[in-house]
């Protein structure tokens, strides 16, 4: 049977390779039954996760799942790092797996790598 607990479906050890200067939406897939929970994003700093209070967020509703979205408009080099979403549900705190953003600063890259290059040559992300 379907669980009626809130579930956050960020994939474990997930990663995104993105370019500074581009817009990006980081999605937290949320499953809930009745009342939509209060969801927040935080950014990991060592073992603590610092709540992102003043960032633009929005909800996207689909048939079987909803997405709580953190907007990067645009992506900045210091957006590099790991993020986690969490939900308050019936006075329980549910935390997602963390997801990591690898930001390439295009100003420091000699040329903008294509998506195919980034997929086949991941070391481009670290130069």
């Amino acid at each position: 049977k379907e669980s009626c607990d809130v579930q956050l479906y960020i994939k474990r050890q997930s990663e995104h390779s993105i370019l500074a200067g581009d817009p990006f939406e980081l999605e937290c897939p949320v499953k809930y039954c009745a009342n939509r929970p209060h969801v927040t994003w935080c950014k990991l700093n060592g073992t603590t996760c610092v709540k992102l209070e003043d960032r633009q967020t929005s909800w996207k509703e689909e048939k079987n799942i909803s997405f709580f979205i953190l907007h990067f408009e645009p992506v900045l080099p210091n957006d590099n790092g790991s993020y986690r979403c969490s939900a308050n549900f019936q006075s329980n705190l549910i935390e997602s797996h963390s997801t990591t953003l690898y930001v390439t600063d295009v100003k420091s890259a000699s040329e903008r790598p294509s998506k195919d290059e980034m997929a086949s040559r991941p070391w481009l992300l670290y130069r």
Epitope: Y9, I10, K11, S14, K115, A119
Partner: antibody
Amino acid sequence: EVQLQQSGADLVKPGASVKLSCTASGFNIKDTYVHWVKQRPEQGLEWIGRIDPANGHTKFDPKFQGKATITADTSSNTANLQISSLTSEDTAVYYCVSDYYGSSLLDYWGQGTTLTVSS
Amino acid sequence: EVVMTQTPLTLSVTIGQSASISCKSSQSLLDSDGKTYLNWFLQRPGQSPKRLMHLVSKLDSGVPDRFTGSGSGTDFTLKISGVEAEDLGVYYCWQGTYFPYTFGGGTKLETK
């Protein structure tokens, strides 16, 4: 019913490249990771790597980096493993494996594709 | 990489007898999320591997409760209480805590 259907057995010549496919039914591969596992004749299992079909991000065992390429096409719900510069060492059964919502738990296995490299 | 060492290589049992397989990792498999990503798989002759156990001790659906998984850190054990003919094959442990993910070398369970 959740299923992973892999492409049929392949016989290829040394030095060539080959692309193996894995088509999912009963779930959306965007919601999972798809892994590839190698098993040489009468040998154990080796994890090659995995793809996140939602964004194309891949991870590999370093020994397969540069040798294997993993791609995914979410419109056809298919993941692919391409192996280049084939040698007899690449003769093996290759399995695609998915895990539910990227849980890293290797839930569902395809039936395997037998690849034979021979001149 | 994390090395997974399984013992014994081969286990010869009489049907109905109990069996125990050991799996040791070269470092602790406890992840930062508090979970231990250690699975057990069975590969019967001519078939794809099938997961029996995940997160050390969680039995997969359809797997009989004669299978039990235990352990923590670097030492793990799969026990079968009363081996049946359908249990014969090669057992693999696997770690999904660290990249690259790695399998143990396998333990062949056969009849005497």
